[in-house]
């Protein structure tokens, strides 16, 4: 019998100061590059070691970014999302969704998304 996999979803506001090498993370997703099945949202695929996000410590690989400086990231092309981040200024406010897997039985499967490939 298969166990049920639940997710504890929390939201958090993260304020980052852009570092010498930018914000210090990579993103995937968008309407033209779906990362999770039936979801065109923008997700964190990699945190750069010693970058701004890593030094802050709250943003995690796999997090969904809901907004940047109050601007919603829904229904954006991937490159439009990239441009929004790159042009977001020195102080950047991110609304993020953390999704923590709560396992009840065998390990489940989260769409086709896998930040590490």
């Amino acid at each position: 019998m298969n166990g049920r996999v639940d997710y504890l979803v929390t939201e958090e506001e993260i304020n980052l100061t852009r570092g010498p090498s930018g914000l210090g993370f990579n993103i995937v997703g968008g309407t033209d590059q779906q990362y999770v099945s039936n979801d065109s949202g923008i997700y964190v695929s990699r945190i750069k070691e010693n970058g701004a996000a890593a030094l802050d410590g709250r943003l995690q690989e796999g997090d969904k970014i809901l907004s940047v400086n109050g601007q919603d990231l829904k229904n954006l092309l991937h490159q439009d999302a990239v441009d929004l981040f790159r042009n977001a200024g020195y102080a950047v406010s991110l609304r993020v969704q953390h999704r923590l897997q709560v396992q009840n039985g065998p390990i489940g499967h989260r769409g086709e998304g896998d930040p590490s490939g």
């Epitope: 090498s21 930018g22 914000l23 210090g24 993370f25 990579n26 993103i27 995937v28 033209d32 590059q33 990362y35 964190v44 695929s45 990699r46 750069k48 070691e49 970058g51 991937h78 490159q79 990239v82 981040f85 790159r86 086709e112 896998d114 930040p115 590490s116 490939g117």
Partner: nanobody, 126 residues
Framework: HVQLVESGGGLVQAGDSLRLSCAAS????????MAWFRQAPGKERDFVAT????????NYADSVKGRFTISRDNAKNTVTLQMNSLQPEDTAVYYC???????????????????WGQGTQVTVSS
């Protein structure tokens, strides 16, 4: 298990062309930024070129601009580097590299990449 396998290196004369290829497996290739780096004997690994997930955006080191062209085929999980007008100073081991997603930090530092091939030797004689 992630694998990046380069091919196409060899010994050529100055002014000749070579086409390097990198075959990726074990990753969802279409999500990845891909790049080529090179390392000459006794020197650091240097950035050559990078290409975004869709192939619409490329970036080149100044030393190869106008001579080298990076491209990708997401259907075949391959990235290629077409090298024209090769010079002796292009002699190096060429490495394919990949990282998931689009960087908001930079894409020219080897530390920006998670996965690497074993390299292919390119030697240009004068």
């Amino acid at each position: 298990h992630v694998q990046l396998v380069e091919s196409g290196g060899g010994l050529v004369q100055a002014g000749d062309s070579l086409r390097l290829s990198c075959a990726a497996s074990g990753i969802t290739f279409r999500w990845y930024t891909m790049a080529w780096f090179r390392q000459a004997p006794g020197k650091e690994r240097d950035f050559v070129a990078t290409i975004n997930w869709s192939g619409s955006d490329t970036n080149y080191a100044d030393s190869v601009k106008g001579r080298f062209t990076i491209s990708r085929d997401n259907a075949k999980n391959t990235v290629t580097l077409q090298m024209n007008s090769l010079q002796p100073e292009d002699t190096a081991v060429y490495y394919c590299a990949g990282v998931p997603g689009t960087s908001l930090s930079g894409e020219t530092d080897p530390r920006d990449y998670d996965y690497w091939g074993q390299g292919t030797q390119v030697t240009v004689s004068s």
